[in-house]
């Protein structure tokens, strides 16, 4: 499996779109900032075999896609940017799925690192709960946007390390 330069461009475009989606000054949202306890250790990538790392990355993209494709999300963000964001995420998920299929035959270890996948799921549950508690306010969405931008940049760095291993 080769996470190509095209995939790397997808990552950069995804981050760029996330940056463009900002609709409110973060300086007016300091009261709403929140620590979502991003599971950083799952993205360090050293302890993982490739198939496991890819499955964690895929889960991250899938959960991000789910979060931003809700009705509440559609109301919060610019429709055109959101559509572009979906396309980029969808493309990245396809690339990762292709990699997962290839890697299964190569490695004898279980495909899914259950604990890592669960950590990512719980992280997104914390984000969803926060949005509900804040009644999907503009500031809550801005805080979440900033958080997802950071987590996507961790994902991008892990993918870079995987590419270097190829």
């Amino acid at each position: 499996c080769n996470l190509s330069q095209t995939h790397s461009l997808n990552n950069r475009r995804t981050l760029m779109l996330m940056a463009q989606m900002r609709r409110i000054s973060p300086f007016s949202c300091l009261k709403d900032r929140h620590d979502f306890e991003f599971p950083q250790e799952e993205f360090d990538g050293n302890q993982f075999q490739k198939a496991q790392a890819i499955s964690v990355l895929h889960e991250m993209m899938q959960q991000t896609f789910n979060l931003f494709s809700t009705k509440n999300s559609s109301a919060a963000w610019d429709e055109t940017l959101l559509e572009k964001f979906y396309i980029e995420l969808f493309q990245q998920m396809n690339d990762l799925e292709a990699c997962v299929i290839q890697e299964v035959g190569v490695e004898e270890t279980p495909l899914m690192n259950e604990d890592s996948i669960l950590a990512v799921k719980k992280y997104f549950q914390r984000i969803t709960l926060y949005l509900m508690e804040k009644k999907y306010s503009p500031c809550a969405w801005e805080v979440v946007r900033a958080e997802i931008m950071r987590s996507l940049s961790f994902s991008t760095n892990l993918q870079k390390r995987l590419r270097r291993k190829d």
């Epitope: 981050l15 940056a19 463009q20 900002r22 000054s25 973060p26 300086f27 949202c29 300091l30 009261k31 900032r33 929140h34 620590d35 979502f36 991003f38 805080v143 979440v144 900033a146 958080e147 931008m149 950071r150 987590s151 940049s153």
Partner: antibody, heavy 123, light 112 residues
């Protein structure tokens, strides 16, 4: 290696204007918020302005609001501080600083600083 | 604005012994999210400030573990367990809880 190279400091008369620059290298400049902080002759640190990574949002304390303008050119990896209607109390060493990536907890720690550029306002 | 208060000088310390530097804020820096938005910076003679501690107790990258920080939300202490000659300089506390961000006036570490 992260580097912030500053320039533009000078001696100016009260009421005058000056533009400071901060050229960034060694990191993806467009992904980070930036600030200007000044150090007065009595060695106090005084935060002057902040700008978001994309440059759309800024904030200033009352002491400089309406006189100072922070801006950035992400294509040139450069941060600017346009200062006008300068007063003697603006005399200081001016530092540009990068903000650590904070995510949803908005951590505005300043993890890298420029070498500073000296501004003296005197007649 | 939140006012950060520091003593101008620390008690003189001998190299190899421990030192403490205090800082007080005019308002609690503990956010409802559980994070205390208190920071420590060190400015060595002739240099730019550098980040030492973020969010009250976390060591910045590359900072030796001789440094530690604790506090209550209003009163904060920076500790250096074994002072070295290179630790000399001015230590500034700062808050990022509210805008405008504010700094303490700085405490100079004095060596006996």
């Amino acid at each position: 290696e992260v580097q912030l190279q500053q320039s533009g400091g000078d001696l100016v008369k009260p009421g005058g204007s000056l533009k400071l620059s901060c050229a960034a290298s060694g990191f993806t400049f467009s992904s980070y918020g930036m600030s200007w902080v000044r150090q007065t002759p009595d060695k106090r640190l005084d935060w002057v302005s902040i700008i978001t990574s994309g440059g759309s949002y800024t904030y200033y304390p009352d002491s400089v609001k309406g006189r100072f303008t922070i801006s950035r050119d992400n294509a040139k990896n450069t941060l600017y501080l346009q200062m006008s209607s300068l007063k003697s109390e603006d005399t200081a060493m001016y530092y540009c600083a990068r903000h650590a990536e904070g995510g949803g907890n908005y951590d505005y720690a300043m993890d890298y600083w420029g070498q500073g550029t000296s501004v003296t306002v005197s007649s | 604005d939140i006012v950060m208060t520091q003593a101008a000088f620390s008690n003189p310390v001998t190299l190899g012994t421990s030192a403490s530097i205090s800082c007080r804020s005019s308002k609690s820096l503990l956010h409802s999210n559980g994070i205390t938005y208190l920071y420590w910076y060190l400015q060595k003679p002739g240099q730019s400030p550098q980040l030492l501690i973020y969010q009250m107790s976390n060591l910045a990258s590359g900072v030796p573990d001789r440094f530690s920080s604790s506090g209550s939300g209003i009163d904060f202490t920076l500790r250096i367990s074994r002072v070295e000659a290179e630790d000399v300089g001015a230590y500034y506390c700062a808050q990022n809880l509210e805008l405008p961000f504010t700094f303490g006036s700085g405490t100079k570490l004095e060596i006996k």
